[in-house]
Interface confidence: low
């Protein structure tokens, strides 16, 4: 996260470190006890590694009473994701057991009816991605609150010239952003999962390359077959 | 209102082991960690440890890893700690203090169990 | 771990007096994981300041905390009797938690 600021401790439940041999990779966020959400590009960057995923965490290193590292029994991605581009970029995975929900772990309602948010809607998304240009990565759970931008203007020449489809959307990125590391995190409106954030490799910070999110109303009747 | 009521005061032979009790009131006790601190006589605060009476899950100062246990009981709000091996350097007051997960801070304090170990 | 280290140890202030307490830390934390406790002689500690500068419910005006990084202060505007009693800074920023090493704050 660029520019945002440490997030309050275990005040985001649903909120998952997707870990590839005990380092966090990406982001996720808890949608059912035993299913986790993320982007289908971060299993890729996983190459044969143990999956796993951390629950109840503010700090990756320090020791916390909430914290708990499951296991991963099945990892599902999107059936049209690809390599080559952002499109569909979900993954579903599902946790070894249920998770024991508490305070400090709790799943998030995701938006199911397929409509824009809109615009200029201030979201928060949250993450342990990198802090800083040089790469420097948080301890502690980090988040910014980032106005939605619309779609017309996102798909700007000057901005991503044409790539925002009906079912991603974007949010402005001017010095506050997501960035690497953050990929598969939630982006929230007004409580709701509204957006789970893409795993390409966009320049951060920049306001002519607004951040690109995956609507997850748009992919509710896929979500649903895979948690049936 | 927020109460923590603590068991009273205890004096045990040196080698034994004792179990203090934290039983909570006011609030929904699964919804706060409840931590554990001892001062010893004149001396400052030194915290022992934490558990999230949710989960059971425990987090503890290294020096006290093998001297203390903390546990819960969900059904009636109360929380543990079992000291054991007792020695003169654990002759203290301890107190349970709620805080953490809704509060970054120590909002709310036990009135202390004094814990005298002499033979 | 992270060590808090609180001067002056002993001090006797007048009513009406400035007093100013402070705690040194040993690795910069964040302003909001700082806070700062009352005891009086035979009671449990009180919450009184947390996040820094935040008066905890019941605190008087006169008590201010400031502070950033490594370095943060305790202030009493104008000492009364009800505020002698030992004050302990503590940090939140990490595991194990930490206390400072106290300052008794006496009235002459």
């Known amino acids: 996260i660029l520019g945002g600021r440490e997030a309050e401790a275990h005040a985001r439940p649903y909120m998952a470190s997707v870990q590839v041999n005990g380092e966090h990779l990406c982001g996720g966020v808890l949608v059912a006890e035993q299913w986790v959400l993320s982007a289908a590009h971060c299993l890729e960057d996983a190459a044969d590694g143990k999956v796993q995923v951390l629950l109840g965490a503010h700090s990756l290193s320090q020791p916390e009473p909430s914290k708990r590292l499951y296991d991963v029994l099945r990892a599902v991605p999107h059936p049209d994701s690809r390599p080559d581009t952002i499109d569909h970029d979900l993954l579903l995975l599902q946790l070894s057991e249920k998770a024991t929900l508490g305070p400090a772990v709790r799943p998030l309602p995701w938006q199911r009816v397929d409509r824009d948010v809109e615009p200029g809607t201030l979201c928060d998304v949250a993450g342990w991605g990198i802090v800083s240009h040089a790469g420097r990565r948080p301890d502690r759970l980090q988040h910014v609150l980032l106005p939605v931008l619309d779609r017309a203007t996102c798909n700007r020449r000057t901005h991503h010239d044409g790539a925002i489809t009906q079912r991603m959307m974007c949010a402005e990125s001017n010095r506050r952003d997501s960035c690497k590391g953050d990929s598969g995190g939630p982006l929230v409106c007004g409580g709701v999962l509204e957006g789970v954030v893409t795993s390409g490799s966009r320049v951060c910070g920049n306001r002519k390359k607004p951040g690109i999110y995956t609507r997850v109303a748009s992919y509710a009747a896929w979500i649903d077959s895979v948690l049936a | 209102e927020v109460q923590l009521q603590q068991s009273g005061p205890v004096l045990v032979k040196p080698g034994a082991s004792v179990t203090m009790s934290c039983k909570a009131s006011g609030y929904t006790f699964t919804e706060y960690y409840m931590n554990w601190v001892k001062q010893s006589h004149g001396k400052s605060l030194d915290w022992i440890g934490v558990?999230?009476?949710?989960?059971?899950?425990?987090s503890y100062k290294q020096k006290f890893k093998d001297k203390a246990t903390l546990t819960v009981d969900k059904s009636s709000s109360t929380a543990y700690m079992e000291l054991n091996g007792l020695t003169s350097e654990d002759s203290a007051v301890y107190f349970c203090v709620r805080g953490g997960l809704r509060r970054n801070y120590f909002d709310y304090w036990g009135q202390g169990t004094t814990l005298t170990v002499s033979s | 771990e992270i060590v808090l280290t609180q001067s002056p140890a002993l001090m006797t202030a007048s009513p009406g007096e400035k007093v100013t307490i402070t705690c040194s830390v040993s690795?910069?934390?964040?302003?909001?994981?700082l806070h700062w406790y009352q005891q009086k002689s035979g009671t449990s500690p009180k919450p009184w300041i947390f996040?820094?500068?935040n008066l905890a419910s019941g605190v008087p005006v006169r008590f201010s905390g400031s502070g950033s990084g490594t370095s943060y202060s305790l202030t009493i505007s104008n000492m009364e009797a009800e505020d002698a009693a030992t004050y302990y800074c503590?940090?939140?920023?990490?595991?194990?938690?930490?206390f400072g090493t106290g300052t008794k704050l006496e009235i002459k």
């Open positions: 996040g820094t500068s």
């Open positions: 690795s910069s934390i964040s302003s909001t994981n």
């Open positions: 503590q940090q939140w920023n990490s595991y194990p938690f930490t």
């Open positions: 558990i999230n009476p949710y989960s059971g899950g425990t």
